[in-house]
Amino acid sequence: LTCLGGFASPGPVPPSTALRELIEELVNITQNQKAPLCNGSMVWSINLTAGMYCAALESLINVSGCSAIEKTQRMLSGFCPHKVSAGQFSSLHVRDTKIEVAQFVKDLLLHLKKLFREGQFN
């Protein structure tokens, strides 16, 4: 049974599927939010360029006690090749300005939709 269980486990998720699922989660967050997302918590904004996924995770991982973004944090970790822990800012090259989590998620969502349309899945 143990061996058969191995056959049943899913293989790697295609990058296009993973990106689509992340976009869907961010859409879900933005649409279902009645109160301000994470009650106004501020995070470092990021450059939406190379290393964006790790930078996004490094910024969001510091927010605690906000269940609405826990799934997003987990999903972003799948896109980032290295382990990210709170207080780590190696991918946040410039700590320029802080924005509310709600704005951060909106900005990230717009950019990810653009990447998806352009077929940039990694």
Partner: nanobody, 116 residues
Amino acid sequence: EVQLLESGGGLVQPGGSLRLSCAASGFTFKSYGMDWVRQAPGKGLEWVSAIGPTGRDTYYADSVKGRFTISRDNSKNTLYLQMNSLRAEDTAVYYCAKEYTPFDYWGQGTLVTVSS
């Protein structure tokens, strides 16, 4: 329980100065970065400045760079914001915040009004 109490706001003329203070309690102040955030009448929250746990690392919004100075005294569990060359657009309620915490844990704020 995190408690933050801001003070030092008031009415000041354009070009004037104010120093805001924030007394912190209920957490190990010296271990956390801190933020100043403001909310102008009828507007959303705007991040103003941040400071690292030791006070060595400081960060500013472009709108206040060169005019505002953030500092902290870990022995007194107090955060400061020195505001110089104040402008009408700096009018807002100023909040201090333990970094990454929701506004439920912020102070009640202190009102700064810049007007002639």
